[in-house]
């Protein structure tokens, strides 16, 4: 349409820009492998790397695994987004006693107020129920059946979450971990168990602090101990260790008290897209066939991409490109165009850069 022409002409001759007829503006064309953060990018900072599914781009521009909320006692609060992790919280009826980055290392059931006490503040995902003495004139013989189950000798302002002790199974609060199905489903409706010598789950100045060995008075060797599969990061927070559960990953170093598990690509594969303590995408070592060529592209990021040879050229099989990562080979007849979800595909010409996904299918490198 003629009215578009004057605007469109202003973009011509500048390969780094294009004219969007819909918004009638010149827009910056993000380099290959980077993706726009707005509909009409204006500058290079409007283009970012796109991570694999279940990874997000952290502040340092690294693809980092989103935490998982797969434990029985956790629910997803916010989903994994391109630039922020999934956030997990304790499921309804439970509160977090030991927090972790974007998650909770240990959840307990909300306590039930004992006889003579009523709920002052109901429990939330972050806080336990807070109890207060029943108002004068309200019979301790139960203002509400929820708040009065059995007689109690003392009154406490805060209901204590108490774990099941070996001798009893009537406890109201119990830490729940991933492997255990919630046997205490109805426990939040029960009364608390008699105080036991165990300190686990008791309110303290720092729930989650527990000595790594018996802690003598004045000893400096009492450090915070995280739940299994969590480690203590540099900031002193319990952080989930990465998982190596993907088919193409193996554990390189285990999850320790002060360091994450690290994963690496299983034998026969090489990391094409790195991630913190892991690899976001593993690709098979190349098997150089007569009709393929491996060639690193000059890209804005370190990921290696590969292209099929121009027709009629002799292959030049180079198993270790400049960045030291071995590329995957691709067949020119199998080039596919896909997004980062690698689901439905469109063919692309043989000059388009492709890599192999962890499923072995050719995938156009999305960073």
């Amino acid at each position: 349409f003629p009215q578009d022409r004057p605007f469109e002409d202003t973009c011509h001759g500048n390969p780094s820009h294009y004219y969007d007829k819909a918004v009638r503006r010149c827009c910056y064309r993000c380099p290959m492998g980077l993706f726009p953060t707005q509909q009409c990018p204006q500058r290079p900072t409007d283009c970012r790397k796109q991570c694999e599914p279940d990874y997000y781009l952290d502040e340092a521009d690294r693809c980092t695994a989103c935490v998982t909320c797969s434990r029985d006692d956790l629910v997803e609060k916010t989903p994994c987004a391109w630039n922020s992790s999934r956030v997990c919280e304790c499921r309804p009826g439970m509160f977090c006693s030991t927090s972790a980055v974007n998650s909770c290392a240990r959840c307990f059931f909300h306590s039930v107020c004992p006889a003579g006490m009523i709920v002052k503040f109901p429990g939330t995902a972050q806080k336990n129920t807070v109890c207060e003495p029943a108002s004068p004139g309200v019979s301790p013989a139960c203002a509400s059946p929820e708040n009065c189950k059995e007689p109690s000798s003392g009154t406490i302002p805060q209901a204590k979450p108490t774990p099941v002790s070996p001798a009893t199974s009537s406890a109201s609060t119990m830490p729940v971990r991933g492997g255990t199905r919630l046997a205490q489903e109805a426990a939040s409706k029960l009364t608390r168990a008699p105080d036991s010598p165990s300190s686990v789950g008791r309110p303290s100045s720092d729930p989650g602090l527990s000595p790594t060995q018996p802690c003598p008075e004045g000893s400096g060797d009492c450090r915070k101990q995280c739940e299994p599969d969590y480690y203590l990061d540099e900031a002193g927070r319990c952080t989930a260790c990465v998982s190596c559960s993907r088919d193409d990953l193996v554990e390189k170093t285990p999850c320790a008290w002060n360091s994450s598990r690290t994963c690496e690509c299983r034998p026969g594969m090489i990391c094409a897209t790195s991630a913190t303590n892991s690899c976001a995408r593993c690709v098979p070592y190349p098997i150089c066939a007569a009709e393929t060529v491996t060639k690193p592209q000059d890209m804005a990021e370190k990921d290696t991409t590969f292209e099929a040879p121009p027709l009629g050229t002799q292959p030049d099989c180079n198993p270790t490109p400049e960045n030291g990562e071995a590329p995957a080979s691709t067949s020119p007849t199998q080039s596919l165009l896909v997004d980062s979800q690698a689901s439905k595909t469109l063919p692309i010409p043989t000059s388009a850069p492709v890599a192999l996904s962890s499923t072995g299918k050719p995938v156009l490198d999305a960073g």
Partner: nanobody, 123 residues
Framework: QVKLVESGGGSVQAGGSLRLSCAAS????????MGWFRQAPGKEREWVAR????????YYADSVKGRFTISQDNAKNTVYLQMNSLRPEDTAMYDC????????????????WGQGTQVTVSS
């Protein structure tokens, strides 16, 4: 160089159907979108529909929802717009556009455009 070629336009009676095609050649980015816009004489260009070619997710303007269907043929690198129950107000030049999904959004860039195909619906 990316090239988009539209076809399938023509004249049709109100209530009739047409199927537009947009064939893409040359390099197309991954995580991409292909979509249709239309512009009637003297009016603003209007977005009609788009498909995220990787996931297959489809989106439509309210004015065409339930009447138009966008689809793709992976083998032919082609996107189609099936237009049913056409109305006189659907008369316009239909343009195909291609670009990339915007991170964290369902909108797309429109980096490449075809030359357009005319659709005329008479009452």
């Amino acid at each position: 160089q990316v090239k988009l070629v539209e076809s399938g336009g023509g004249s049709v009676q109100a209530g009739g159907s047409l199927r537009l095609s947009c064939a893409a050649s040359g390099y197309i980015y991954s995580s991409n979108c292909m979509g249709w816009f239309r512009q009637a004489p003297g009016k603003e260009r209007e977005w009609v529909a788009r498909i995220h070619t990787g996931s297959g997710s489809t989106y439509y303007a309210d004015s065409v929802k339930g009447r138009f269907t966008i689809s793709q043929d992976n083998a032919k690198n082609t996107v189609y717009l099936q237009m049913n129950s056409l109305r006189p107000e659907d008369t316009a030049m239909y343009d195909c556009a291609a670009g990339r999904v915007v991170l964290g959004a369902v909108v797309c860039t429109n980096e490449y455009w075809g030359q357009g195909t005319q659709v005329t619906v008479s009452s």
